[in-house]
């Protein structure tokens, strides 16, 4: 149960020995007692003992102090669990009884008496002490206390709270006097299963199945979790974040597994050799003449470049070498022969010529062979042709190299480069590493190859008004606010302020065009003219004599590029027209022009681009004056001129816009 | 090329204690988790015990904390086991690898047994 | 710990053989699973980590997949060289635990 109400029942006094009938009991009353237990009555009725009901042995004769007895029969206290909400309230009824017969079980026995009863109603709340009460009548006094306690789990006001203190996988904890759990030291949570981590352990990075524990997840390690772990492959390389490698100072490629400095630090190369720091193993060795091999560390042979002639055979000394002559020759190299025609001397069909006037001889020889007497099969490959550990390979009357892998050439001289086929799309750096190339990509790319493309679209926060359309710019972070008619501005966000006499405006307007129209189409024929006549030294001086405000709205002519010829370029500086230039048949090359990258562009990061005003490519001109605006004047058969602004997170700068 | 090197095996008695070492070599040592782990004769591979690269922070399995202790010289590009109080069932190769208990292990030594019996 | 349990434990097959072992763990271990290769009295080598990334320098007929508590290991053409024991490892959970392994023999 989940309560347990306790009568402990004291002292009975009948002193005359009477029944509650008046009779008096023979030889004396021999009490027991039964006990009912229900809800709170206002007037106490018969009916089941709801809350539960006890009977005792007969515990003593008249008058008698009941003792308090923990276990067996006649126990005292008395037990009345109940398996309920303690409520609060009760009603209880104690009656004494006297039984002729057994002493053990007396209220089975027929011909029982009652002595006395008492009825105690009211409210008793959960708690261990004890509440003590005496009740009298005319006959008897019962001396008693009673309280209500918690069957061992269960706490709280009514018993209602269970509460079993464990130390297992569900939960390390005890129980507070009000059923709450007190956590174990060292553990946490409702229902104290979490275990308090180590000290400082990282909340993300690490995690503990017990206390004072720092397991760390994935990619992590350390006693605080808060050090990454690099790539599984990594060699010389430490991380910022897990399974990074990001190389020390020297080293390089994909796992930092390539020595930049192989030669300083292990000198492979042998016999005063040059080492560089390249090829497929990240050195190459120079030899010096008389040595081959990967590091040099052969020697050739002197004997290696045939000395001896007509057969003779050469043995090595120590600094030179010695030829043994054939029968007939004779001299250092066996270059004299004792021999005539007559002798025959020359093999493999071999050809014999008297010479000092049949005196000696000389031999000519068919192909592939050769020596003073043809003695010799071509060997083309004696001199060691083949550089950089190439295998030199006889092919009849020529010889071929067969090369290692990363070398190539008629003598593999020549070290092939992955990065010469440009593997590296939109302007990576290639690096030429042992298992292939590798690139760094520029800002806004990535991948194996930096083909692909960072898509950010500085776009997406609509930052165009009055309905402009906006495109994304050449770096993620630039976009082009296209204006529709009366709007202009960086963002499109300002309108053209036309007073309201708005036909006089109109004529002035018209008429101004007109006459604006009319000096341009002199100012070209002029220009044109002086083209003619002024050499370029000329044409730099009158740059020079323009004002600054003047030349902040000129484009440098090497930096433009116009492959369509029939195409001008005009730049237009908003409604004063005074120092606005025109440029015509100047090429507009953006691939390399610093200026026109303005001056937070970043040359060498964008892939170069052959694309010229006769396509529809925004090109970006820096100009001081915001307000600038430069279009493309189409050929003829384009109807409309786009004015468009870039905007960059640093400046405004002007733009070229072309509709094809 | 990464190499790592196991000495200090042999045949021990129960109860009787042994030094392993393990020389490392082409990685920056420092940087790296590192990790033994054993396989005993016929059967499987078993984690032993891993040391994290800077701060030297041990983790062991249950049935060998207390009598194993791991330890690294960054210096010296070492690793070490100190087994005491050895029992028969931690006969086994012992391998050094280079690796975490939350990581897979990349690079192995050749391995070095380790015989307890009487 | 965490159970990993290799099937089968032991496999015949010819060379040019498709071959496939599978690794059971007996709770979610996402992707943190590798594959080793072990010949007999060499040491374990890296095969396959976070179930299907290929080492460096593993030949291109090896490759894993699976997710959740099941991966698999596929040889698609059997070599010679293949014939090893292949383990399968967990390094989700705290202790790393490793299957018992399967003999991959020749037919």
């Known amino acids: 149960g989940s309560g347990i109400f306790q009568l402990r029942l004291q002292e009975f006094v009948n002193q005359r020995g009477m029944l509650a009938n008046g009779q008096s009991c023979e030889p004396g009353c021999r009490t027991f007692f039964r006990i009912c237990l229900k809800h709170f009555q206002a007037t106490f009725s018969e009916g089941p003992c709801t809350f539960g009901n006890v009977s005792t042995p007969v515990l003593g004769t008249n008058s008698f102090v009941v003792r308090d007895k923990n276990s067996g029969s006649g126990r005292n206290p008395l037990q009345l669990p109940f398996n309920f909400t303690w409520p609060g309230t009760f009603s209880l009824n104690i009656q004494a009884w006297h039984t002729p017969g057994d002493d053990l079980r007396p209220e089975t026995s027929p011909g029982n008496s009652l002595i006395s009863q008492i009825i105690i109603q009211g409210s008793l709340a959960v708690g261990k002490i004890w509440r003590t009460d005496e009740q009298n009548d005319t006959l008897t006094r019962l001396s008693y206390s009673y309280r209500v306690i918690c069957s061992d789990n269960y706490y709280g006001e009514s018993c209602s709270r269970l509460c079993k203190k464990r130390d297992d996988h569900f939960g390390h904890y005890e129980c507070q006097p009000d059923g709450s759990l007190s956590c174990l030291p060292g553990w946490t949570g409702k229902y104290c299963d979490q275990p308090i981590c180590l000290s400082g352990c990282h909340e993300q990075n690490g995690y503990c199945s017990k206390p004072d524990e720092c397991i760390c997840r994935p990619g992590w390690q350390g006693r605080l979790c808060n050090e990454c772990i690099p790539h599984n492959g990594c060699r010389h390389g430490t991380c910022s974040i897990p399974w990074q490698c990001a190389c020390d100072e020297g080293w390089g490629g994909l796992f930092c597994d390539q020595d930049l400095n192989y030669c300083t630090h292990h000198s492979p190369c042998k016999n005063g050799s040059t080492c560089s720091n390249s090829g497929p193993k990240g050195y190459t060795c120079t030899c010096l003449p008389g040595y081959t091999g990967e590091h040099c560390e052969l020697g050739l042979s002197k004997c290696a470049s045939n000395p001896c002639r007509n057969g003779g055979s050469c043995k090595d000394q120590e600094n030179s070498y010695h030829c043994l002559c054939p029968p007939g020759y004779y001299g250092q190299h066996c270059e004299h022969s004792t021999l005539t025609c007559a002798d025959s001397p020359c093999f493999n069909g071999g050809s014999c010529r008297e010479r000092n006037q049949g005196s000696s001889y000389a031999c000519e020889c068919p192909p592939n062979f050769t020596g003073s007497n043809c003695e010799k099969k071509v060997d083309r490959c004696t001199s060691n042709p083949c550089a950089n550990g190439g295998q030199c390979q006889n092919r009849g009357p020529s010889r071929t190299c067969r090369c290692r892998p990363g070398f190539t050439g008629t003598h593999c001289e020549l070290h092939i480069s992955d990065c010469a086929r440009s593997p590296c799309a939109h302007g990576g750096t290639c690096h030429d590493l042992e298992n292939g190339p590798v690139c760094t990509c520029p800002a806004g790319f990535s991948g194996r190859r930096c083909e692909v493309r960072i898509t950010h679209d500085a776009c997406a926060s609509g930052p165009c008004f009055n309905g402009a359309t906006c495109y994304t710019g050449l770096s993620p972070n630039n976009f082009v606010c296209n204006c529709p008619y009366g709007f202009v501005g960086s963002r499109c966000e300002f309108p053209v302020g036309l007073p309201p006499s708005f036909p006089w405006v109109a004529v002035s307007l018209g008429v101004g065009l007109v006459v604006l129209l009319v000096l341009l189409v002199m100012v070209v024929v002029a220009v044109r003219q002086l083209r003619l006549r002024r050499p370029d030294d000329e044409s730099r001086e009158a740059m020079n004599n323009l004002s600054d405000f003047q030349k902040d709205n000129l484009i440098p002519a090497a930096q433009l590029k116009n492959t369509n010829q029939k195409k001008e370029l005009e730049v237009d500086c908003g409604l004063d027209k005074s120092n606005c230039g025109k440029l015509q048949n100047h090429t507009l090359d953006y691939n390399l022009a610093p200026g026109l990258l303005g001056r937070g562009g970043m040359p060498g990061k964008y892939p170069h681009s052959d694309k010229s005003l006769g396509e529809k490519v925004p090109l970006r001109l820096h100009s001081e004056k915001p307000e600038c605006r430069i279009s493309a004047i189409c050929s003829p058969r384009d109807s409309m001129y786009q004015s468009v602004c870039l905007i960059s997170e640093e400046r405004n700068e002007c733009v070229i816009a072309t509709e094809v | 090329e990464v190499q790592l090197v196991e000495s200090g095996g042999g045949l021990v008695q129960p109860g009787g204690s042994l030094r392993l070492s393990c020389a490392a070599s082409?990685?920056?040592?420092?940087?790296?988790?590192m990790a033994w782990v054993r396989q005993a004769p016929g059967k499987g591979l078993e984690w032993v015990a891993t040391?994290?690269?800077?701060?030297?922070?041990?983790n062991y399995r249950d049935s060998v904390k207390g009598r194993f202790t791991i330890s690294r010289d960054n210096a010296k590009n070492s690793l070490y086991l100190q087994m005491n109080s050895l029992r028969a069932e931690d006969t086994a190769v012992y391998y050094c690898?280079?690796?975490?208990?939350?990581?897979?292990?990349?690079?192995w030594g050749q391995g070095t047994l380790v015989t307890v019996s009487s | 710990d965490i159970q990993m349990t290799q099937s089968p434990s032991s496999l015949s097959a010819s060379v040019g053989d498709r071959v496939t072992i599978t690794c059971r763990a007996s709770?979610?271990?996402?992707?943190?699973l590798a594959w080793y290769q072990q010949k007999p009295g060499k040491s374990p080598k890296l095969l396959i980590f976070?179930?299907?990334v290929l080492a460096d320098g593993v030949p291109s007929r090896f490759s894993g997949s699976g997710s959740g508590t099941d991966s698999t290991l596929t040889i698609s053409s059997l070599q010679p060289e293949d014939f090893a024991t292949y383990y399968c490892?967990?390094?989700?959970?705290?202790?790393?635990?490793f299957g018992q392994g399967t003999k991959l023999e020749i037919k």
């Open positions: 976070d179930t299907s």
């Open positions: 690898a280079r690796g975490y208990y939350n990581s897979p292990f990349a690079f």
């Open positions: 040391i994290s690269g800077s701060d030297e922070w041990p």
């Open positions: 709770q979610e271990i996402y992707r943190n």
């Open positions: 490892q967990q390094y989700t959970y705290y202790p790393p635990t």
């Open positions: 082409g990685f920056t040592f420092r940087y790296f988790p």
